[in-house]
């Protein structure tokens, strides 16, 4: 099939002791090979500080996956989710303030 670019969505969930989990979800993409990783101040986070979901079919002939990491509350602006898919790439910030999600479709 032809390339379908991912929809990328970044969300935050509050956890205890001043830390939050930020999750970057990519959905509705084809083919299944995708790079999704977190950066802090432009530097890639190590694998041992990130958690990935499997790349799974979403039932529409496309795929979905996610990557998450735990960060200090108040440092959201230092983190971005980086995506590469089929020769395209994009960088997605963590939403600030009261906004708890951000999504963007790549073309």
């Amino acid at each position: 099939g032809s390339t379908v670019p991912p929809m990328v969505n970044v969300t935050c969930s509050e956890v205890s002791e001043g830390n939050i989990t930020v999750t970057c979800r990519a959905s509705s993409f084809y083919p299944r090979n995708i790079t999704l990783t977190w950066r802090q101040d432009g530097v890639s986070l190590s694998h041992n500080t990130q958690q990935w979901g499997d790349v799974l079919p979403d039932g529409n002939g496309t795929y979905q996956t996610w990557v998450a990491t735990r960060i200090r509350q108040g440092e959201e602006q230092r983190f971005t989710c980086y995506m590469e898919h089929s020769g395209n790439h994009g960088t997605h910030p963590v939403p600030s303030g009261n906004s708890h999600h951000h999504h963007h479709h790549h073309h």
Epitope: T35, G42, S44, H47, N48, Y82, H85, G87, N88, G90
Partner: antibody
Framework: QVQLKESGPGLVAPSQSLSITCTVS????????VNWVRQPPGQGLEWLGM???????DYNSALKSRLSISKDNSKSQVFLKMNSLQTDDTARYYC??????????????WGAGTTVTVSS | DIQMTQTTFSLSASLGDRVTISCSAS??????LNWYQQRPDGTVKLLIY???TLPSGVPSRFSGSGSGTDYSLTISNLEPEDIASYYC?????????FGGGTKVEIK
């Protein structure tokens, strides 16, 4: 067919800088990372750094102050520049494509390498 | 940095032998381990990624296993073209680091 080919000066004088070019074919630099790895004579492999599809770079912190990685997407070329070379920088320098898929990150295709000797 | 140790610098084996090469990490690496083969002419090839996955084109006589800090590469039936040096590499934590290599020779 994915290929990478390094080209370098061969001989560099101590304290001078090194420039190596990696020319790639069979894939786009906008959608793949390229890594630099070196191997001193008779020793193991050492990761120097990488450049991502968007041009962002990651470096080995032990060498970061001397290293610069850049690229020209239109020419399918990646460039390694290292300053203040010493004799222990003598090595074979490789570029390798990085595949980064979730829990998996590996260097799936390597160039043949180019030998750099630091000597006066 | 995470230190990767291959205690056997070189080993001699007969054609058809089963050969096992060990690699240990200075801390747990969550199966974030790859193996590479370097032929005598310097050519480097990916052999196994994520501890045990074989890329397409790699013969099934190669296999990988391990967990925590201890990992191994096994060649079940040594062939002449397997004469090479083998390197483990972790990517749990940046920078990625390699073992010192194990050279496999024919007895």
């Amino acid at each position: 067919q994915v290929q990478l080919k390094e080209s370098g000066p061969g001989l560099v004088a101590p304290s001078q800088s090194l420039s190596i070019t990696c020319t790639v074919s069979g894939f786009s630099l906008t959608g793949s990372g390229v890594n630099w790895v070196r191997q001193p004579p008779g020793q193991g492999l050492e990761w120097l750094g990488m450049i991502w599809g968007d041009g962002n770079t990651d470096y080995n912190s032990a060498l970061k102050s001397r290293l610069s990685i850049s690229k020209d997407n239109s020419k399918s070329q990646v460039f390694l520049k290292m300053n203040s070379l010493q004799t222990d920088d003598t090595a074979r320098y490789y570029c390798a494509r990085g595949a980064h898929y979730g829990k998996r990150w590996y260097f799936d295709v390597w160039g043949a390498g180019t030998t750099v000797t630091v000597s006066s | 940095d995470i230190q990767m140790t291959q205690t056997t610098f070189s080993l001699s084996a007969s054609l058809g032998d089963r050969v096992t090469i060990s690699c240990s990490a200075s801390q747990g690496i969550n199966n974030y381990l790859n193996w590479y083969q370097q032929r005598p002419d310097g050519t480097v090839k990916l052999l196994i990624y994520y501890t045990s996955t074989l890329p397409s084109g790699v013969p099934s006589r190669f296999s990988g296993s391990g967990s925590g800090t201890d990992y191994s590469l096994t060649i079940s039936n040594l062939e002449p073209e397997d004469i090479a040096s083998y390197y483990c590499q972790q990517y749990s934590k940046l920078p990625p680091t390699f073992g010192g290599g194990t050279k496999v020779e024919i007895k």
